[in-house]
């Protein structure tokens, strides 16, 4: 593996920036194999930092093309089954050493991200990634820790509640310590190094090994390459290996069989039938998430990715939490749908970012002819007679408060109430006492009604009430219609937006 300036990129740069000695570390991070790799997501499959890092000291005129790198392997243990498809993130960090640097200073020099497909147990896959002016060459492979086996490192351990409960001769299962190692289920004698089994009494061989117990290297097999050794003393069996045997895909490509032939899924940076062509151009589609690739017409010219909204990173591989910028105003709820940002507005606000304050009560619908009243920075409904509650949706009993005085009987009416007064009383609420001797009423009643028959008087009062009610209802209808017209465009927009949001969230 190597890390240094890419070819044709001018004078090699020192990673130390002429600030004294430094050393390089690699941080390797594995994430589940999705293209929308969220920046905040953890390295769910595992992460590790390189160790045993040599110090690099810049000397005048020295080429930085071959930098001393961390020795040996970077092991990234993963606890669960191997997913096969994953995102590989490799960060190159510089640690600046020396007193004048103010103690150790860390800087991220480069970060490469790529989606990969890789079966466990396969050979080393080689890769090269460029980022800016730096180029990173590396190899990677996935291996199962016994007793997990197979391309997906399937467990062959039996579930138990505690290691102490493991039966005679059985040990705790690694790397699943809450389970116990199962008794051998593979064919007796199956090589623990080069063979594995996914079913009891079978012995499957890792690449490069053959034979009934996977103990024969492929190169020393007595069979031709087109045949597979059979059970002991049976010679060779036909048919020969599948089209993916021997892995025809170069540069870490993974092979899959397709109707008698093979297909290579190449890592980014490689293409061709067998992933044999290297050098990234825009035609290779190096930008994730639909990003626009600019430049990079030939392998020697660098490309730049212009990312869609909600993505960033040199290859648009990082997801941005756009809601963290609090784009929704007036307490609106932000929803980042990936390809769009939506704001769910509080009552009384509208617009793509809840920026419109629906003043003049336009955003408040009072039901049943209620009128909206503003005051003190809030809105409330003044309900028509017979209705109550926050939005005038609750039916109120107008007679509940016993509004008719002096023993008058209350009758609920569509527009409110009517009082039938007891003899000797009159008025909308029977509040006036009528003197039987024709003297003034207390309080005084209109002259023309003093000697009136109470029944005729009541009919007159009802007629007046009806006229007043009709006038009020007509006024309310006009107000409601005009308000509805003003609200229509906002409500229509809100309903459409909520519908879109619902569809997009379900998409």
């Amino acid at each position: 593996h190597s890390f240094g300036p890419g070819p044709g990129l001018g004078t090699p740069r020192s990673p130390c920036n002429a600030r004294g000695p430094c050393r390089l570390f690699f941080r390797v991070c594995l994430k589940p194999g999705v293209s929308q790799e969220a920046t905040e997501s953890l390295c769910a499959l595992g992460a590790a930092l390189s160790t045993s890092v040599p110090v690099y000291t810049e000397h005048p005129g020295e080429s930085a093309a071959a930098l001393p790198l961390p020795d040996g392997l970077v092991r990234v243990p993963f606890r669960d089954a191997w997913p096969g498809t994953f995102s590989l993130v490799i960060e190159t960090w510089r640690e600046q050493l020396g007193e004048h640097a103010g103690g150790p200073a860390w800087n991220l020099l480069a970060r490469v991200v790529g989606r990969r497909r890789l079966a466990a147990g396969g050979p080393w896959a080689r890769d090269v990634q460029r980022t800016g002016t730096w180029e990173l060459h590396f190899s990677y492979r996935a291996r199962c820790e016994p007793p997990a086996v197979g391309a997906a490192c399937a467990r062959l351990c039996r579930s138990r509640s505690a290691p102490s409960r493991c039966g005679p001769g059985l040990r705790p299962c690694t790397p699943f310590p809450d389970e116990c190692e199962a008794p051998s289920v593979c064919r007796p004698g199956c090589s623990p190094e080069h063979g594995y089994c996914e079913e009891p009494d079978e012995c499957r061989c890792l690449e490069g090994w053959t034979g009934p117990l996977c103990t024969v290297p492929v190169s020393t097999s007595s069979c031709l390459n087109s045949r597979v050794p059979g059970p002991a003393s049976t010679g060779c069996l036909l048919p020969g290996p599948g089209p993916c045997d021997g892995n025809p895909c170069a540069n870490g490509g993974s092979c899959s069989e397709t109707s008698g032939s093979f297909e290579c899924a190449c890592p980014r940076g490689f293409y061709g039938l067998r992933c044999e062509v290297s050098g990234v151009t825009c035609a290779d589609g190096p930008c994730f998430n639909g990003g626009l690739c600019v430049g990079g017409e030939d392998p020697d010219s660098a490309y730049v990715c212009h990312c869609p909204p909600g993505f960033q990173g040199s290859n648009c591989e990082k997801r941005v939490d756009r809601c963290s910028l609090q784009p929704c105003q007036n307490g609106g709820l932000c929803l980042d749908l990936g390809h769009a940002l939506r704001c769910r507005c509080r009552a009384g606000f509208a617009g793509p970012r809840c920026e419109h304050d629906l003043d003049d009560c336009a955003g408040r619908a009072c039901a049943n002819g209620g009128t909206c009243v503003e005051g003190g920075g809030s809105r409330r409904c003044s309900c028509a007679l017979g209705f109550g509650g926050r939005d005038c949706r609750e039916r109120a009993d107008p007679c509940a408060s016993r509004p008719c005085a002096h023993g008058g009987r209350c009758y609920a009416h569509f527009s409110g109430l009517v009082c039938a007064c007891a003899p000797g009383y009159m008025g909308v609420r029977c509040e006036f006492a009528v003197r039987p001797d024709g003297a003034d009423a207390v309080p005084a009643a209109p002259r023309g009604l003093r000697q009136a028959d109470p029944q005729r008087f009541l009919a007159g009062v009802i007629a007046v009430i009806v006229v007043v009610v009709i006038a009020i209802v007509a006024g309310i209808v006009v107000l409601v219609i005009s308000r509805k017209k003003r609200m229509a465009k906002y409500e229509k927009a809100e309903i459409k937006e909520m519908g879109e949001m619902h569809r997009e969230l379900n998409a």
Partner: antibody, heavy 117, light 107 residues
Framework: EVQLVESGGGLVKPGGSLRLSCAAS????????MNWVRQAPEKGLEWVGQ??????????HYAESVKGRFTISREDSKNTVYLQMNSLKTEDTAVYYC????????WGQGTTVTVSS | NIQMTQSPSSLSASVGDRVTITCKAS??????VSWYQQKPGKSPKLLIY???NRYTGVPSRFSGSGSGTDFTLTISSLQPEDFATYYC?????????FGGGTKVEIK
């Protein structure tokens, strides 16, 4: 050289079906989001739909005007994307282009679909 | 959906003229605006992305500007091969939407 070639257009009656194909060459097809964009006669451009990558479970998105009637699919092994159009209406008459990415960087030459009785 | 309103719908100009086409978005689209050129019988070609960045191979006489809701495509010195229809498109909010187009004709 990048090339996108559409085919499958033609004359169809309202209510009928048609399947358009777009064959790509010169690009690593499986790494590209693919779109269909149409242009009615003497009119502007209208995005029709999109299909993403295998790693995105081949997620598809459609314009409201075609939702439920049009279906986009892709066959990476053949470097081809398809547009299956059912219950066609006269207003679907247009030149249909396939195009790549989120920003429609590469375009095909287009194929004409005429819906008429 | 976000509406993109382009003006003028057509214009006549001579070779060497400076031509300006405007595009107005119905709401803030940041700088997520692209411009496309389409010649008769041909497919559109990407000219400008991110409101002001020239795409690969696009001549320097084409420039874009603007952010928010108001955007401009300028051709500093019109060439014979520039007579075409130009479309703006917004990519801030899904689905992407286009302007009605501006036809640039020879005077």
């Amino acid at each position: 050289e990048v090339q996108l070639v559409e085919s499958g257009g033609g004359l169809v009656k309202p209510g009928g079906s048609l399947r358009l194909s777009c064959a790509a060459s010169g690009i690593t097809f499986s790494n590209f989001w693919m779109n269909w964009v149409r242009q009615a006669p003497e009119k502007g451009l209208e995005w029709v739909g999109q299909i993403r990558l295998k790693s995105d479970d081949y997620a598809t998105h459609y314009a409201e005007s075609v939702k439920g009637r049009f279906t986009i699919s892709r066959e990476d092994s053949k470097n081809t994307v398809y547009l299956q159009m059912n219950s066609l209406k006269t207003e679907d008459t247009a030149v249909y282009y396939c195009t790549t990415g989120y920003y429609f960087d590469y375009w095909g030459q287009g194929t004409t679909v005429t819906v008429s009785s | 959906n976000i509406q993109m309103t382009q003006s003028p719908s057509s214009l006549s100009a001579s070779v060497g003229d400076r031509v300006t086409i405007t595009c107005k978005a119905s709401e803030n689209v940041g700088t997520y605006v692209s411009w496309y050129q389409q010649k008769p019988g041909k497919s559109p070609k990407l000219l400008i992305y991110g409101a002001s960045n020239r795409y690969t191979g696009v001549p320097s006489r084409f420039s874009g500007s603007g952010s928010g809701t108001d955007f401009t495509l300028t051709i500093s010195s019109l060439q014979p091969e520039d007579f075409a229809t130009y479309y703006c498109g917004q990519f801030y909010s899904f689905p992407s939407t286009f302007g009605g187009g501006t036809k640039v004709e020879i005077k």
